[in-house]
Structure formats: C-alpha cells, structure tokens
C-alpha cells in the first residue's frame, strides 16, 4: 500500500493543508497563555503546565498524551538565605552587596516564586579573596592570562563576562586554573545592542538584569546521579561525589550595574589588548586584587544554594503512522523555564503547540501520517538537557531501531532577521527544497520565497546562491538523540544579523524580563517569524513523517566529509615536522572519504530508480537512509566523553553551544605543542584518525548494495 | 503623579524613639531605590540614608549609623526610618527621595530626583 | 562638615549670569556624577541637574553643569528673579560609602 493509498489525500495536497492550518494569531494566543506565570522545572507551576498540555493535545486529536516523569537532581537558591556578593573591608564589613533579585518588569511587580538570579548545580560557599578579571573565561583567555602575563588564578575569585562560549565551560576553565570561586556577568558590550533601549522601553538589557543558567559540564550524561540510565523509581543513584559535570567552586551571576562596583576598582595588570574590554566605564585591568586606595579590600561569596532530587514531567505525544507506524519522527522542544520563558523556551512551546494542532486537524479529517510522529514537551532541559535524555536513556533500543528523524524546538526567535538552521548534511536538501516552497516574512522580500531571503541575509561560505547551514553543537534537547543516538536531527529558528549585532544570543536571555510583552512589542508584534518558524519545524516533520522515501541526500555528507576531513588535515600540518618525525597520515581518512562519496553516489543512482511499489524494497532503501546516521556512531564515545559518540560531530570541547567536526582528531591535536608526552600525544591523533576513518569507510558500507 | 508623603513626625524627647514612614505612588516603588535626607532649621540639606530596591545594601551617615535603621516594604510601597537614642542635633525636616536613575549605574549611588515635602522632627526635653 | 564646598552665596542682576563652584575630592566628584538641587524658599529640594550636565525635563537650558577633575560647577544664564534659592552640589562619596551634599549657595537676585 503507497502512502497515498493509506491517506487518502495526494501528499502535495497534504502538506499545503498542514501549513495553511498553522495561524500567527493561535502561536500569539499559546505565547500568551504559557507566559504568564514562572515554569521553573521541578515546580508545581510546571507540573500543571505540562497536565494542561497533555489534555490540550489529547484535545487536538493525538492518538494517545502521557506524562513520563523521572526523578533527577535539580538544584534552588535556599529561600531564607539568598546568594550574593560583597565587597568587604580590611575589617571584614561589607561594604557592597549585590542585588538579591533582579528588579520586577511592569504589571509583574506582584508574581511570586520568581527564583531570583543563580548559577544551577553551584556548590555552597563564602569563599573571600582578590579578583581576577578572565575576560570571557574561554581556554583561550585562561592561556593568555597564564602563559603571556603569567597570572596565577590559584586561590582567587575570577570574574568572567557572559557570551561567546557555553558557561558551564566557563566554570571548567575557572576550576582547571586553580580559582575557588566565579563571577559571571553581562557586559553591555555583549548585551547591549547600540541604538536601543533597555527593557521595558526596548529588547536590552538592563543593569539590574542578569542570566540564569546551569553551569555543569555532563557531557551529554543527562540526569547527573545516574549516568546513562533512567532516573526512575528504582533507579541506583551515584553519591553526590560522584555525581556527573557537578561544579567544585561557589558560581554567582550578576548584572552589569553590579559588576560595575567590583570592576571599577580592579587594579594589577592592565588588559592585555582591547579584546579584554567591555563597554562599562571601567579600566578593564585583570588584577589580581583592588587597586591603590581599596587594595585592602576583598570579594566574598555567599553561596546557599541546593541540589535535590525533584521529579519532573516531560508530556510524550503520538500520533501513529498508517503505513509505518514503528518509524519514529519526533518534534520535540522544551516547557521549563528561568522565569516566564519568553522566548525561552516557550516561543517555541508555542510553535509546537499549533504544529500538533494542524496535525490533529488533518488527523480529523481522516489523514494519518505514513510514519508515526511523536510530539514532546521536555522538562528541565534549563538544568542540563534532563527530561530528554532521560526519556531516551528509557527509550534508547526503540529509538535506535526506530529512530527517524528528531526536529528540536526550542525559542523560535532569537531576533527577526533571517532563518537560522543547523542540522545534519542529510536534511540539507529537505531544508533547501521546503524554503524554496514557503513564502519569505522578511520586509523587502514581498512574494519572494523564504529560501531567497535567506540566502540573501545569510549566504554559505562556501557555496554560492546557497543559504548557510551550520553544524549541530549542543546546549539544547537534540543533544541525546543525535550526539549519543545517532539520529539525524535538525533545528530552525529566526536570528538576528550577526553581522551588526555581535552580542551574544539576545540581550535578555534567561532574565526576568523575558516576557511576553518582549515578543509582541519588540521582537514579532504580529508573530509572522513565528509562523514562518512554525512552517519550517512543522514542513520538515510533515516530510520527515509523510514521504515515500526518506527525504535524506547522502550525497551531502559526502561533500562535508572532505571538507572536514581537509581541516582537520590542514590543522594537523602546522607541526609538518612532528608529522614526518611520528609518521602521521591522512591517507586512510581520504581514502574513505573518497569511497564514502562513490558509494553515496552509486546509492543515490538507485535510489532514483529503484521500483517504489516494491514495499520490501522500499523499505530496505528507507532503512539504509535512516541508519546512515546511526553508523557514525563509535559504541565506545569520545575520549573521556562516553555519551557523546558520534565520530563526525561533537560539541566541541571549548564550548557546549558549538559543533566541532572530526571532535577525536581536533582534541588530540589541540595544544599538542605544550604537551609533556609528545610521542604519546601523536599516538593518540594517529589513534583518531584510524577510528576515523574506519567510522566513515564502515558508515561508506551501509550504502552499498546489501548483496 | 508621582508622589512621595512622609508621615510619623514630631516631637520627641532626647533617647527616645521614632520612626518614619513615607508613603509612595505613581511609579513602581520596587524597582527604585530611596533615600532619606534632613535639614536642620537654618541649615543646609544632609543626607541620612539610603536602602537599595531589594534591601540588599543600606548606607548611612556618620552621624546616624548605629542608631538610625532605613527599611522598605515593598508590598506596601512604603519607605522607613526608624530613629532611636534621638539628640537634639537630630532635630529637623526629614524628607524622603527617590533615588535617580541614570543607566550607569544602581540608582541608588547617583542621588535624587523626586522629594516628598517633608516631616518635622524636633528632639527637645 | 560637608565634605563638598561651595561659596555661600552668589548674586547678580536679573539677565545676568552666575556661576556656582563645587570642589571635592578623587573619592566623590573624582570618581562619580554630580548633581545640582535647587531650593526655593520653605520648599522641597527640586534636581536642577543630574550627571555632571544633564537636565530633567521641565528645569531651563538657562541652568548648566559642568564637571572637571575634582571640581564642578553650575551656571546660570539669564538670571530671574525666580531663580532666587539656595543650590546645592551633591555626588557619591567612595571613601565615605555615602552621598554628600555641598555647603550650600544662596543666589540672590539684586
């Protein structure tokens, strides 16, 4: 039976259905609805969030809704003794405080439970000392103060602005420098746009604002008290101690009117270059310590935060294929937020909410999809990406065997500029080929489509009339089903122009101010990006769900293959001489590459030809697409990273956020010239390459033909 | 409009207690912070005190600190001042003020920009 | 003491101008924003002008701030009869940890 037989409706027909049930003005309403009071994970508030989803979509017309629920480890300021800091005198007053919550934006002056600015997962502590300013905290930054202006961290206090890289990062490199406690805060050259007001008048930041956030380091390991297993009732659960990614040292956020007080009297050495400094009317000077007149005073830290382990709920919706119902498309995003979630997560809650409404419109209707999909809203994704790898770890032999495609949902804006997409090489063409369908909400782009727009405001680097398309890092819910599962995924959001705007993601990220008054009178006031969003995540489901073969172009991973493989190689050989001397070579890793794109190549040819009313066929053309990801798995992970083993792609080790290619190779040579060992150290990039190129010659051997 | 009133002057006997209320309105008095300053009869204006929105850094003169305690309630959009061991020098008009925001920095560091009309305090035996 | 000095009074001819000295230290206009209050007779202290030069709305381009080292000043151009009040300078103390007002300098309108 094709597809169509199973429907009923021409798929052409479908599709246009789906996207012309998708309305601006329901995305608005849920928006609204969703934003009016916190969703902190592990709250009542979110409980009764995700109740009411269930019933919603139950409501819409999804076969079946469930709450899976898990109990993980969470972690709360504590109520009667707020986190701040102080600066303290020789007598050990305090002389200074920080602000003990962020000032309330209009008509929400009386919410209660608005947890009050933290760094999750921090541990306890008063720890007093001198201040070092870091810069952003990256590796790089730490060997800059280290190496070039050999500045001892040991024992002090770092303070470190917010951007450019994840903060649990951040936390690591503090920690790996010997620090024993860290700042965080924003910088107005980081969170302040030029030219626009500060919330409420306008999208930035005020002084009094500050981001939320985790600062673990899991690896991809979810819930930190069981590391690759269910955190369920009869879950065995690691001590504290030997809890995964906790942090070591007291971790605080503050705003910039805040760090104002502390930077303004920094002293020791100047900043290195002006890539150290920031926008505020301060000298920028690293330290250690306070400057002439206040050189006897300190910082101190009180930190009383608590780890507990907390149920939380994620809301697991289905809607089951006619033809193939144990393929699995997922369209998953997140419900938990810092505060009311604005943006994040619920602009994109929002878009997932209509997505499942037009399907269940058409399900009414006496459509089904030919694949099964699975809709989720996932719980503590703000505490470490919890609630989805939770449900994965659970559901882990279903979804390897079952496992299409995973589309993320989380904010679908993060300014209104132009489309952003990051997703496997094996949906480019899907991506490509839909935008090319849907009409651009761009001013200045009337009629034209969004493909069009897109690669207007955004051209590849490499290829031209082509859009770019980056890789998948992490920091978000795809994480597990990709980076540990091997499941093809992608994710799509409007962004801002990168190229004016080099603050890092949106000003009021993760404060109290964002809101919903944010989105409806600063970022999208009639919700045309969100509804173009909205027809970006839901057209790559529908297609995902409803073609007849898997919209994947293996020939796609062919091409990124070598050009990964050529930087890696060109990395490599900056040490020509260490390369000679350790015999290293790229040869193998070329030689698969060469037969991943031949055999790519020759399955493409038969997949235009093969006899499509053949279901067996069908199918088994279907699997080799579907499992293609799957073979870049490496079932024993990266060095020290056992859950994140994907051989192409890994979040790269610097920062979370960011997608590194060839992670095994790129590890092993980062700072290869300082290491102690260096025939040992060569050992391990030949090492890699092999697994390497072993990994893309066998994934190479998924596509040939089976006999 | 924005409003400020004091309230909870007058006269009181030296060692004795006192305390000030001022009631706010016509702006979103958890979001600002305030201050207390006093003039003597005759004489110029002191500043007394200052409490930051969330109560996490108070500041007083010299000539108060240890006796003087400045506080808010912010569901009652209502500053304090709570005077105890009163002197004569204390004897004055206090006022109450908003404190001035300037985007550079808390409020609370760059003075004020709105004023009550002021409560008589006079410490006399 | 006022730890910010003013002269303790100013006068001129109504169209004239006047200009009012605040000195201080590093630790108060050195390092933070000077403000300006007038005080008209029997009333509330009014802000005249706010970091180191700026206005509120509704107080005359007449009235002007100006800052330099540890020292400011506040001009008055155009004297009126209605400007007839005493002015004070105030800024941030660092040392201190408070605010400090000047001596105070009553304008009078000859």
């Known amino acids: 039976k094709s597809s169509n037989e199973a429907t009923n409706i021409t798929p052409k027909h479908n599709m246009k259905a789906f996207l012309d049930e998708l309305k601006a003005e329901n995305i608005k309403k849920f928006l609204y609805n969703f934003t009016q009071i916190p969703h902190l994970a592990g709250t009542e508030q979110n409980f009764q969030l995700a109740k009411q989803i269930q019933s919603q979509w139950k409501e819409f017309g999804l076969d079946s809704v469930e709450l899976a629920h898990y109990d993980v480890l969470l972690s709360y300021p504590n109520k009667t003794h707020p986190n701040y800091i102080s600066i303290i005198n020789e007598d050990g007053n305090e002389i200074f405080n920080t602000s003990l919550f962020e000032p309330p934006p209009p008509g929400y002056e009386n919410v209660s439970d608005i947890v009050p600015p933290f760094s999750a997962f921090s541990p306890q502590g008063m720890p007093e000392g001198d201040l070092v300013y870091v810069n952003y905290a990256r590796t790089e930054d730490f060997f800059k103060l280290e190496r070039d202006m050999k500045i001892n961290c040991s024992g002090k206090i770092v303070i470190a602005r917010y951007g450019k890289v994840f903060r649990g990062n951040k936390v690591k490199n503090a920690q790996l420098a010997g620090a024993k406690g860290v700042i965080l805060y924003s910088d107005p050259a980081d969170y302040f746009a030029p030219g626009v007001k500060s919330y409420p008048d306008g999208w930035n930041l005020p002084g009094g604002g500050v981001q939320r956030g985790n600062i673990l380091n899991l690896n991809g390991a979810g819930d930190p008290l069981t590391p690759g297993y269910p955190a369920n009732e009869y879950a065995y659960r690691r001590g504290i101690a030997e809890a995964v990614g906790l942090p070591s040292i007291p971790v605080h956020p503050i705003g910039y009117y805040d760090a104002q007080k502390l930077l303004e009297k920094m002293g020791g050495s100047a900043p290195p270059d002006s890539s150290w400094r920031g926008s505020l009317k301060v000298p920028y000077n690293v330290g250690p310590g306070f400057t002439g007149n206040f050189s006897t005073q300190k910082v101190k830290m009180h930190i009383h935060s608590t780890n507990e382990v907390t149920r939380i709920y994620n809301v697991i919706g289905t809607l089951r294929g006619a033809v193939e119902p144990d393929r699995y498309v997922i369209l998953g995003g997140h419900r938990d937020s810092w505060v009311f979630g604005g943006i994040d997560p619920q602009s994109g809650a929002a878009v997932v909410h209509e997505i499942v409404r037009s399907f269940g419109t058409l399900k009414k209707e006496g459509w089904r999809p030919r694949r099964t999909i699975l809709f989720a809203s996932w719980d503590a994704e703000e505490f470490g990406l919890l609630g989805s790898t939770e449900w994965a770890e659970e559901n882990s032999r279903l979804l390897q065997e079952r496992g299409v495609a995973y589309i993320n949902a989380d904010s679908s804006i993060e300014g209104n500029y132009t489309l952003r997409v990051d997703c496997t090489p094996l949906m480019y063409s899907l991506v490509h080929n839909l935008t090319k369908e849907l009409k651009s909400p761009d001013e200045g782009f009337e009629g034209k489509s969004l493909y069009e727009s897109w690669t207007k405001k955004s051209p590849s680097p490499e290829f031209s009339g082509m859009p770019r398309i980056s890789k998948l890092g992490s920091g978000n819910d795809f994480e597990v089903f990709f980076q540990r599962l091997g499941i093809a995924s992608g994710r799509a959001r409007y962004t801002k122009n990168w190229e004016t705007n080099k603050f890092s993601g949106y000003p009021l990220y993760h404060s109290v101010y964002e809101t919903y008054e944010l989105v409806e009178k600063f970022y999208d006031p009639m919700f045309k990006y969100h509804l173009t969003v909205a027809q970006v995540r839901g057209g790559m489901v529908f297609e995902l769900a409803n073609s007849i073969v898997l919209p994947f172009d293996c020939r796609d991973y062919a091409v990124v293959l070598r050009k990964y493989a050529d930087k890696i190689y060109s990395i490599s050989m900056k040490h020509p001489q260490e390369m000679k001397t350790y015999s290293v070579s790229f040869d193998s890793l070329f030689s698969a590459v060469k037969n991943f794109t031949e055999i790519a190549s020759k399955f493409s040819e038969r997949l235009q030809d093969f006899d499509k009313s053949n279901p067996i066929v069908l199918r088994m053309m279907n699997d080799q697409l579907m499992f293609l990801e799957r073979a870049f798995i490496d079932p024993l992970g990266l060095p020290d990273r056992p859950f994140y083993r994907h051989v192409i792609y890994a979040p790269s080790s610097h920062n979370k956020y960011a997608g590194e290619s060839f992670p095994g190779i790129y590890d092993a040579l980062f700072d290869i010239e300082s290491k102690v060992d260096p025939s040992k150290a060569w050992g391990e990039v030949k090492r890699q390459i092999y697994v390497a190129a072993f990994t893309v010659q066998a994934a190479a051997e998924t596509l040939s033909e089976v006999a | 409009e924005v409003q400020l009133v004091e309230s909870g002057g007058g006269v009181v006997q030296p060692g004795r207690s006192l305390r000030l209320s001022c009631a706010a309105s016509?702006?979103?008095?958890?979001?600002?912070?305030m201050h207390w300053v006093r003039q003597a009869p005759g004489k110029g204006l002191e500043w007394v005190a200052v409490?930051?929105?969330?109560?996490?850094?108070?500041y007083y003169a010299d000539s108060v600190k240890g006796r003087f305690t400045i506080s808010r309630d912010n569901s009652k959009n209502t500053l304090y001042l709570q005077m105890n061991s009163l002197r004569a020098e204390d004897t004055a008009v206090y006022y109450c003020?908003?404190?001035?925001?300037?985007?550079?920095?808390?409020?609370?560091?760059?003075?004020?920009?709105?004023w009550g009309q002021g409560t008589t305090v006079t410490v006399s035996s | 003491q006022s730890v910010l000095t003013q002269p303790p009074s100013a006068s001129g001819t109504p169209g004239q101008g006047v200009t009012i000295s605040c000195s201080g230290s590093?630790?108060?206009?050195?390092?933070?924003?000077v403000n300006w209050f007038q005080q008209l007779p029997g009333t509330a202290p009014k802000l005249l002008i706010y970091?180191?030069?700026q206005r509120p709305s509704g107080v005359p381009d007449r009235f002007s701030g100006s800052k330099s080292g540890t020292s400011a000043s506040l001009a008055i151009s155009g004297l009126q009869s209605e400007d007839e009040a005493d002015y004070y300078c105030?800024?941030?103390?660092?040392?201190?940890?408070?605010?400090?007002f000047g001596t105070g300098t009553k304008v009078t309108v000859l």
């Open positions: 016509g702006f979103t008095f958890i979001t600002y912070g």
């Open positions: 409490v930051s929105f969330d109560e996490s850094n108070k």
């Open positions: 970091s180191d030069n």
């Open positions: 590093s630790s108060n206009i050195g390092s933070n924003t």
């Open positions: 105030a800024a941030w103390d660092d040392s201190l940890n408070g605010y400090v």
């Open positions: 003020a908003r404190a001035l925001r300037d985007g550079n920095n808390w409020d609370y560091f760059n003075g004020m920009d709105v």
